[in-house]
């Protein structure tokens, strides 16, 4: 807390300008009117205040707005945003995407801080859903943003917003998140033709069910091994050797290098060795010839 002292004669600030950088902390406290500061916040960013001086300016705004800053002040916070605590931010009502962008810009170069997470949470809750423009903005600043959301939060993403998602935005998503995003992506891209559709849907396929993979295998998509390795194991297991061969196209040779890793390993164990041999890759571990394959899951369903 800065001590209350009288402003020295002739030092009362009439406007927010460069001369203030020469004020000691106590002079800023005593000589800068909080209301003046609030109306001229747009000037603060052009003045190279020290972080100690910014502490004083924040203190003045906190006194003026104990219930939380108005958006007219928030959008011009600049470096002052770095001084805010999540508790400060919870008092705000941020509705403008421009304000959000301005504050995210200040934090650029840093990981997502608790302050930014709180700001985004307040903003999205205020909007009611994660619309395309917001998602565009958030993923531009934080490519991993989407994968930081819970499946429940992701369920509020409208399919139209999926157009804003880039492949790198999904890099850290787990299967549970892709399970939620895949049906939205399928809906969003449903009117595209085969090859274009595959390019768009590819990053989301970690959430695809077996029947969709079977359908893709009929479309000469040539899925790369990296994508195949991210597919759900339970979705891959029912695929036949012929379907996997069609799905991967020229990339099928890559199965050999991955034969000890999931889902390839588990898929091999489910295939007849005869069928695997037709690939000519030397894949081993399939069901030997003459063995009867019982589908236990089917048996359980009948009993």
């Amino acid at each position: 807390e800065v001590e209350k002292t009288a402003c020295p004669s002739g030092k009362k600030a009439r406007e927010i300008d460069e001369s203030l950088i020469f004020y000691k902390k106590w002079e800023l406290e005593a000589c800068v009117d909080a209301a003046l500061l609030a109306t001229q916040m747009d000037r603060v960013n052009a003045i190279p205040f020290t972080y100690e001086q910014l502490d004083v300016l924040k203190h003045k705004l906190d006194e003026l707005y104990p219930q939380g800053y108005p958006e007219s002040v928030i959008q011009h916070l600049g470096y002052l945003f770095l001084k805010m605590s999540p508790e400060d931010i919870r008092k705000w009502n941020v509705t403008s995407l421009e304000t959000l962008k301005a504050l995210l810009e200040v934090n650029k170069g840093h990981e997502m801080s608790p302050q930014v997470a709180t700001l985004i949470d307040r903003f999205v809750k205020g909007r009611g859903q994660l619309d395309k423009d917001t998602l565009d903005t958030l993923t531009a600043f934080y490519p991993g943003y989407l994968c930081s959301l819970s499946p429940e939060e992701l369920s509020s993403v409208p399919p139209s917003s999926i157009w804003a998602v880039r492949p790198q935005d999904l890099d850290t998503c787990d299967p549970r998140q892709l399970d939620v995003l895949y049906p939205k992506a399928r809906l969003a891209f449903q009117n595209m033709n085969g090859s274009e559709y595959f390019v768009k849907i590819q990053s989301f396929l970690g959430g695809a069910p077996t029947e969709d993979l079977k359908a893709l295998s009929q479309q000469n998509v040539s899925m790369d091994l990296a994508t195949f390795m991210k597919l759900r194991t339970d979705a891959v297991l029912p695929l036949t050797v012929a379907e996997v061969q069609k799905l991967l196209g020229p990339h099928v040779e890559g199965l050999k290098a991955e034969e000890r890793h999931r889902p390839v390993r588990d898929w091999i164990l489910r295939q007849r060795q005869d069928d695997l041999d037709t690939l000519g890759l030397g894949l081993q571990g399939g069901i030997p010839n003459g063995y009867l394959v019982l589908d236990l899951s089917m048996q359980e369903a009948l009993s």
């Epitope: 020469f22 004020y23 960013n45 190279p48 020290t50 910014l54 600049g78 934090n107 840093h110």
Partner: antibody, heavy 120, light 108 residues
Framework: QVQLVQSGAEVKKPGASVKVSCKAS????????LHWVRQAPGQGLEWMGI????????NYAQKFQGRVTMTRDTSISTAYMELSSLRSEDTAVYYC?????????????WGQGTLVTVSS | DIVLTQSPATLSLSPGERATLSCRAS???????LAWYQQKPGQAPRLLIY???NRATGVPARFSGSGSGTDFTLTISSLEPEDFAVYYC?????????FGQGTKVEIK
């Protein structure tokens, strides 16, 4: 033309103080803040602080707080930078530089530099 | 303090070639408060660019600055013999002002 002329080279012992001067000409001395920047031999530039010649107000880099004093004498359009408790790592060329017309943080006119050598 | 990282440390080029120098800030400079200076051996630095892209008085048009936020670039479109020097970027978004470690442009 606008010029900043600095005092000559100095050799000091560790623990001593040095006072470098910077005489301005060709413009109104009190209208432009002055920065002090130093450069150790073969190294980069390091900002020390800034003085407002109009009222003597200063803003020092935390690193130098307590050791640096910036003053001015408006009657002779001269600014001074005094650094105390010198150590060998203070050996550097010290520059004064005038603030840019539009931006207090950038520097459009520089003095020629003063070499300060700290050696026992 | 805001840290500025310049790259490359040294740039070996021939006269007439284009030079591209990079400066990255550890945090966003909200009003693009970044300057570029040129320094030759035994001389004081000389201001080339301020506010990221504005040329200082008397600076030739072959020098241009660009960038915003955290990434900034100084471009010399066609190197003249007198351009071989060390170049520093400096931020003044927040005091203390800080400088990059410098990029030396040398003759190939």
């Amino acid at each position: 033309q606008v010029q900043l002329v600095q005092s000559g080279a100095e050799v000091k012992k560790p623990g001593a103080s040095v006072k470098v001067s910077c005489k301005a000409s060709g413009y109104t001395f009190t209208s432009y803040a002055l920065h002090w920047v130093r450069q150790a031999p073969g190294q980069g530039l390091e900002w020390m602080g800034i003085i407002n010649p109009q009222n003597g107000g200063t803003n020092y880099a935390q690193k130098f707080q307590g050791r640096v004093t910036m003053t001015r004498d408006t009657s002779i359009s001269t600014a001074y930078m005094e650094l105390s408790s010198l150590r060998s790592e203070d050996t550097a060329v010290y520059y004064c530089a005038r603030k840019h017309k539009y931006r207090i943080g950038s520097m459009d006119v520089w003095g020629q530099g003063t070499l300060v050598t700290v050696s026992s | 303090d805001i840290v500025l990282t310049q790259s490359p440390a040294t740039l070996s080029l021939s006269p007439g070639e284009r030079a591209t120098l990079s400066c990255r800030a550890s945090q966003s400079l909200t009003s693009n408060q970044l300057a570029w200076y040129q320094q030759k051996p035994g001389q004081a630095p000389r201001l080339l660019i301020y506010d990221s892209s504005n040329r200082a008085t008397g600076v030739p048009a072959r020098f241009s600055g660009s960038g915003s936020g955290t990434d900034f670039t100084l471009t010399i479109s066609s190197l003249e013999p007198e351009d071989f020097a060390v170049y520093y970027c400096q931020q003044y978004g927040s005091f203390p002002a800080t400088f990059g470690q410098g990029t030396k442009v040398e003759i190939k």
